[in-house]
Every structure is written in structure tokens, then in C-alpha cells.
Interface confidence: low
């Protein structure tokens, strides 16, 4: 599923403000995070977790997030994909 332009703009804005005060405030409430690595071009977070970042093998710098829970690396022949997954601690 592709993201609409509004969602793209929001995601790009999130990248820009990632180091801002609002993120520091969020981090103070307590996040539980873990990394997931999968073979191929998809990595899916566990139930209840959302993607906060993606990483790709083969020096691929091109990725997108699907349904807020899955990282998709966009280069051909991807050997691995990693997702950083977080949720607010219950």
C-alpha cells in the first residue's frame, strides 16, 4: 500500500523534527523499543509496536513504512531489512 502525499509530507516533517523538544518530551514518558531484522526486503514489528526507523542491507538508503508496522527496503535483491520498533510503556 502506498502512502498518500499528505502522509508523505507528515513523515518527512517527522524526520526534520526528530531532534526537537517534543521528541525529548515523548522520550521522558518511557518508550519500550526493540530491533527486528529479517531476511529479504521486509521487516515487521511485533504486535503493538510501531516503526520508528528502518535500515537496509547492501548500502540501500531507500525505504518506506507500510501500515506503520513494517519496513520495506526498496532496492533490488535486498539481503536483509531492519526495523526499529517502539511502543509507549504500559
Amino acid at each position: 500500500k502506498t502512502l498518500c502525499s499528505m502522509e508523505e509530507a507528515i513523515n518527512e516533517r517527522i524526520q526534520e523534527v526528530a531532534g526537537s523538544l517534543i521528541f525529548r518530551a515523548i522520550s521522558s514518558i518511557g518508550l519500550e523499543c526493540q530491533s527486528v531484522t529479517s531476511r529479504g526486503d521486509l521487516a515487521t514489528c511485533p504486535r503493538g509496536f510501531a516503526v520508528t526507523g528502518c535500515t537496509c542491507g547492501s548500502a540501500c538508503g531507500s525505504w518506506d513504512v507500510r501500515a506503520e508496522t513494517t519496513c520495506h527496503c526498496q532496492c533490488a535483491g535486498m539481503d536483509w531489512t531492519g526495523a526499529r520498533c517502539c511502543r509507549v510503556q504500559p
Partner: antibody, heavy 125, light 106 residues
Framework: QVQLQESGPGLVKPSQTLSLTCTVS??????????WIWIRQHPGQGLEWIGD???????QYNPSLKSRVALTLDRSKNQFSLQLSSVTAADTAVYYC?????????????????WGKGTLVTVSS | SELTQDPDVSVALGQTVTITCQGD??????ASWYQQKPGQAPVLVIF???NRPSGIPDRFSGSSSGDTASLTITGAQAEDEADYYC??????????FGGGTQLTVL
Amino acid sequence: QVQLQESGPGLVKPSQTLSLTCTVSGASISSGGYRWIWIRQHPGQGLEWIGDIHYSGSTQYNPSLKSRVALTLDRSKNQFSLQLSSVTAADTAVYYCARDPRGHTYGYGYYFDYWGKGTLVTVSS
Amino acid sequence: SELTQDPDVSVALGQTVTITCQGDRLRRYYASWYQQKPGQAPVLVIFRKNNRPSGIPDRFSGSSSGDTASLTITGAQAEDEADYYCNSRDTSGTLSFGGGTQLTVL
């Protein structure tokens, strides 16, 4: 203003290697923000994606050409190059270089925002 | 081609015309559109389904539904007469173009 300019021989003999270079101005090929593309257009025909290269050295190729194509880049000259081996008359085309903003951290792209003017390469003995 | 376009389309000056691009990959991935005039390099007119680069008139717009992407020119001008190509990616990240549509403005 971003500009791309193709250069290389306009005539190549069959079975030889076609070599073209694209010189980029107004943007750095060392920026992670872009992939650098080669596209060709046979006379009177449509466009064909040949392949692309990222500053990291990551490449992608058209499967139909993969066995004959090599892409490289020269960061010091802000250039990237195409080599197509074992050419035949079927490789006669206008060759374009272009830029794809796909390399940005949030991975959108797969379109070509700047193009060179193109250079005609004829394969003939 | 894995992306299919009608080879020829015509439109009366000032009228609206839609050029289509069909392919299964378009169910998952955006199409982009390029305008090419004789002897010139292609020019990007629409990207990410319906975004215009700076300098492209707002009479150009894009849309998609199912396996079909569309380029619409609302109020076609004589200077819009050109070949139009769509392109998109597949799941492996390789790219392809449609066969092109020659637009004639009558």
C-alpha cells in the same frame, strides 16, 4: 540549477564497449540524496531504463541488460559513467543521464527530476 | 511493455484530455509522467501520483485507480502537443516506462 551533460563517442563498432560519461553540475553525486540514472531511447521508440548508481556504490540494472552493463562514479570529478559491452546495432540509441531523488532518508522517488540533453550513439562498422 | 499506454490520443484546443497508463505494479506503486517534444529530453510533469515540479502548469494533474494511472490536461494548449510517458517501479525496485502516447492538439 542542476545540469547533466552526457559525453562520449558517437560511433561504436559492433562487439566493442560503449562508454559514456555524465558530468553533473549544481549537485553533488556524493550526496546520499540521489541515485544517478542511465536511460536510452531507440530511434523513434520509447524510453528504456538501463540502470542506476548511488554514491555508496549500490547499483541496480535492467535485468535485460544486466550481463552487459557496468555503472561507476568518480566523486572527484562529479561524474558517473556507463559501460555497455558487446554492443550490436540494436544498441543504437539516444542515451540520457538523469537524477532520481530516491536516495533521501525517507525512501521515495523512482522518478527523474533532471535529465541531460542526450547523446546519440550509433553502433556500426 | 509492463506498462501499457494508448499510442495516440488527440484533443481539441482548450479541451480536457486524459492519458492512461495501465499495469499491475500500479496497484502498489506510484506512476510518474514525462513530456517529450521532438529532439528534446523528457521533462518530468507529474511525480508521486499527483505532484507537479516547479514550472509545470497547473493544468497538468495526475490520479490513479486500481491498476491505472492517469495524466489529465485541463484546457490543452498547442504547446502540450508531445509524447507522454509514464514510469513506475516493480517490487524488486527495477523501473520501466510505458510505450508512450503521442498527444495531438487539434
